[in-house]
Each structure stands twice: as C-alpha cells, then as structure tokens.
Amino acid sequence: KFSKQSWGLENEALIVRCPRQGKPSYTVDWYYSQTNKSIPTQERNRVFASGQLLKFLPAAVADSGIYTCIVRSPTFNRTGYANVTIYKKQSDCNVPDYLMYSTVSGSEKNSKIYCPTIDLYNWTAPLEWFKNCQALQGSRYRAHKSFLVIDNVMTEDAGDYTCKFIHNENGANYSVTATRSFTVKDEQGFSLFPVIGAPAQNEIKEVEIGKNANLTCSACFGKGTQFLAAVLWQLNGTKITDFGEPRIQQEEGQNQSFSNGLACLDMVLRIADVKEEDLLLQYDCLALNLHGLRRHTVRLSRKNPIDHHS
C-alpha cells in the first residue's frame, strides 16, 4: 500500500513523486529505506529531496532501492514508498520491456502520444521524438507541448516511440528519455451497440478467501477500428481508479479480433488476497461506445471446500 514503481536510466535525470498524497507546502521527509538514512534537501547533492519530489540528478545504478517519504504534520504523518530501479543504458537500439511505459493506441482520427512522466520535470519545448531509435522527420510528425501528433496514421506507424527532453535544475541540464509502444487501429469497418461476451449477466463467480481472483470483461463493438470504444470495471458504481482499493486493479487485455472479424476488447479485474468484504461489492462490467452503454453485473460468492468422502 502507498508504494509506486519508478525507473530510469543511469546518467539521466529521474524525478519521483511521493506516492502518499499530501498537499503542496507540507514538509516531506525522504529516507533511503535500507539504511533509514535521511535524503538531504540541499540541491548541491546529486540525489536530493525537494518537497514531494525526490530528484536524481543524474541517476546511478547504485541508487536503486526503496525510498520512504513521510508527509509530516503534528497530528498526521503519511508514509509512502518509492521503489526505484536505475538501469544501465543499452548499447543496442532495443528498449527492454522493463523500461517501457504503458502502450497507447491511435487511429487516423486520434494519434496523440504523450511523453510519460514529463509533468514532473522542468523542461522546455520542443521535445525530441524517436521511433525505434530513429529521429522522426517529416511534416507528418508534430511535437506539440508534451505529446507527439502523427498525421494520416498508417499501420506502419506502430512501434516504440521515445521522447527525449532536457530537465533544467539551477542552470544545469540533464537528459531524460521515456519510451512507450504505439499501436494503430484499422479505420475500416462499422460499429454496433456493445455486445458483452463475458461475464454473463448476473453471473455468480466463486472465489476463495485469501486467494487471488480474476474477472474478465470482454465485449465486441463492431468491425475494424472503433472510435470511442471501451470496457471497464466498476465497483459499487465507482470507477476502479476512484474506488482506491489497492488490492483491486484492472488491467487492459489484448485487443481481440475473432474469426468473424469483430473488434473486441478485454479488461481483466485482478483481486489480490480476496477478503470477506469483497463478496459484498457489486462488480459491473461496462462496455460503451457511441451507440451506448451495456452493463453486466457480477457478484462474488465463497467457494466451499470440496468434501472428500472415503
């Protein structure tokens, strides 16, 4: 709980925000968890704390580890943990999976690729963008604020996109790179009112207390690329991200095209360490597009241990 993974490359700047929510101006103390050693606030240090931010300017592989942040007040102390991993720079062009941020999808109508984590840094435009390590050139590519816009997107535009920018700290410049995959959705086809393939309406899913459980919300929306199509889970009518229970997370599955060519989406709801109170929640699989919204409700029930008779 209150823990967040962060990663970066050696000799680049890395800035990490305290995962524990505070408010601006509150004192935040940072510690290196393994030694309980306080992180200095003086900016002359290579690694220093600046309020809710922990700054590695630049980062070194040896900085990897868990950092504790405590948002302090006389009556409330809020503790969070930042799990930081600094990797060596790759000599070849391949960006390993562990350095990739979340994949984004685009189409002819919508082809924005946001540069991940950039809001944490003091940077100035323009961003540099690379695809599969090649600098992007040509009028089709437009670096706009913190995102890249690709005009007339084609399937060949799919790939790994890296943004590169300079973080400035007290007149010193540090390089930062971040990479994410971009997939392209086909524009041909048609759209239908969403059809939820799973779960069945009012399905009862048996789970074991203390074990992990997965629920898959799967729906189809038509053929070809779909404009505004989504599947998501809600808990008691609240979005998973807003519900705020760290044990319950949703994870986007793969886009699926069945043999009949329908465009379908999956969303997997992962419940870690199922608890009694989870059985009381209402789990709604929602599928929506421009035609409307369809909802299938699932309830959890306790799986009784199998009786063994001699």
């Epitope: 209150f2 524990r20 007040s73 006389p74 807003d242 229970e245």
Partner: antibody, heavy 117, light 111 residues
C-alpha cells in the same frame, strides 16, 4: 472527486443515541485520508467531534469522548457516528468531512438533527 | 484545548474594498517552520469550504482575492477586492494538536 453524504434520523429523543451515517463516493475510505464528523448548533460555530482514519484508527474530541463512537462499514464505503445520552444541546447540523492532511478538504451537505421529546 | 478567537464578530465591506479578519490562538500553532492554521468560508445553507491551509496556502480553485498570513498565535485572512458573492461566515481552524478547534466565526456582509 470525493463526495460525502450524511444520512440518519432528523429527530432524536433526549437520553437516546443519535446515529448518523456518511456515505462516501469517488474514493475508498480504506485507501487514505481521515474521515471526520463536525457539528454546528443552529446559528453557532463549528465543533470537531472526531475522526476515523483509513486504517480504522479513531481519535475523538475529549469533550465528547465518553459519548462518541465512530465506526465504518468498508463494504458499503460508509463511516458512522453514534452519540449517546443526547440532550437538547446536541441539536445541530452534523457534517462529515474528509481530511487529506490536517484541513477539512471535502464536506458533506450536512444533516440537521433535533433532540426533542 | 487551543482556543481560537476571531475578530471582528462581523463586518460590512463595500465591493472592491479590502476585508480583514483576524484569528488569535491561545497558544502557538506553529512548529517546524509551518503554521497549522486553516480558513473556511461558509455561505448560508451550505457546508464550509476550505480557502486557505497552513496559514497562507491557497486551496486549489480558490480565487487569488483570498490570502492568509501570520504565524505563532496571530493570523489574518484578507479578501481584496471583496465581491458581492463573498457574503458568508468565515472560520479559522487549527490542527496543531488534538482536539482540532474552530474560531467562533466572522460574518462578512457586502454593503
């Protein structure tokens, strides 16, 4: 956005127990924050009653501690106030509010509870 | 308990003018470089709304016409310039220790 809504009886007889519930939407009460009860007698100022934090730990105003219980129902994302042995002096608008850290950041609309026979 | 005393109890201000409310604590609410004093606005029939936290920090979404200052035991909320819809009761609250307490309120009316 955190939203809070108080509910409960508007009229309680003297010596009985006042019971109110605050339903929270847009955020799980077990994720973080402290969840407060505050009251305001008609035409008067605000009085902090106490809170229950995300972990279930409670802190009460010593002036009311002997009569107050704050609890929660995590399955319904609700927290509750019980105030025993009420008198006419407990007549007030009762608010629930959430605290990110120190200050009361989000408030419910409040519910008027009248203590009268 | 820390007692918070607000003054004046009420004031009437013309639009465009400055309104100043003070809050005095019976003991210091400052420690470790911060002052744990907060200000709220309460309009008739509505719940209070946070305006200022830690004595001088403007809460997100609150107009810059509102400002706070002070440390130790003496704090000030300033509205400059006052607008017609600022008619409300204003409360200070400390979080230096338990129990949290509020001032008795200041009623601001617009002439």
């Amino acid at each position: 956005q955190v939203q809070l809504q108080e509910s409960g009886p508007g009229l309680v007889k003297p010596s009985q127990t006042l019971s109110l519930t605050c339903t929270v939407s847009g955020y799980s009460i077990t994720s973080d924050y402290a969840w407060n009860w505050i009251r305001q007698p008609p035409g008067k100022g605000l009085e902090w009653i106490g809170y229950i934090d995300y972990s279930g730990s409670t802190t009460y105003n010593p002036s009311l501690k002997s009569r107050v219980t704050i609890s929660r129902d995590t399955s319904k994302n609700q927290f509750s106030l019980k105030l025993s042995s009420v008198t006419a002096a407990d007549t007030a608008v009762y608010y629930c509010a959430s605290t990110v850290i120190d200050s009361m950041d989000y408030w419910g609309q409040g519910t008027l509870v009248t203590v009268s026979s | 308990d820390i007692v918070l005393t607000q003054s004046p109890a009420s004031l009437a201000v013309s639009p465009g003018q400055r309104a100043t409310i003070t809050c005095r604590a019976s003991k210091s609410v400052s420690t470790s470089g911060h002052s744990y004093m907060h200000w709220y606005q309460q309009k008739p029939g509505q719940p209070p709304k946070l305006l200022i936290y830690l004595a001088s920090n403007l809460e997100s979404g609150v107009p810059a016409r509102f400002s706070g200052s002070g440390s130790g035991t003496d704090f000030t909320l300033t509205i400059n310039p006052v607008e017609a819809n600022d008619t409300a009761n204003y409360y200070c609250q400390h979080s230096r220790e338990f129990p949290f307490t509020f001032g008795q309120g200041t009623k601001v009316e617009i002439k």
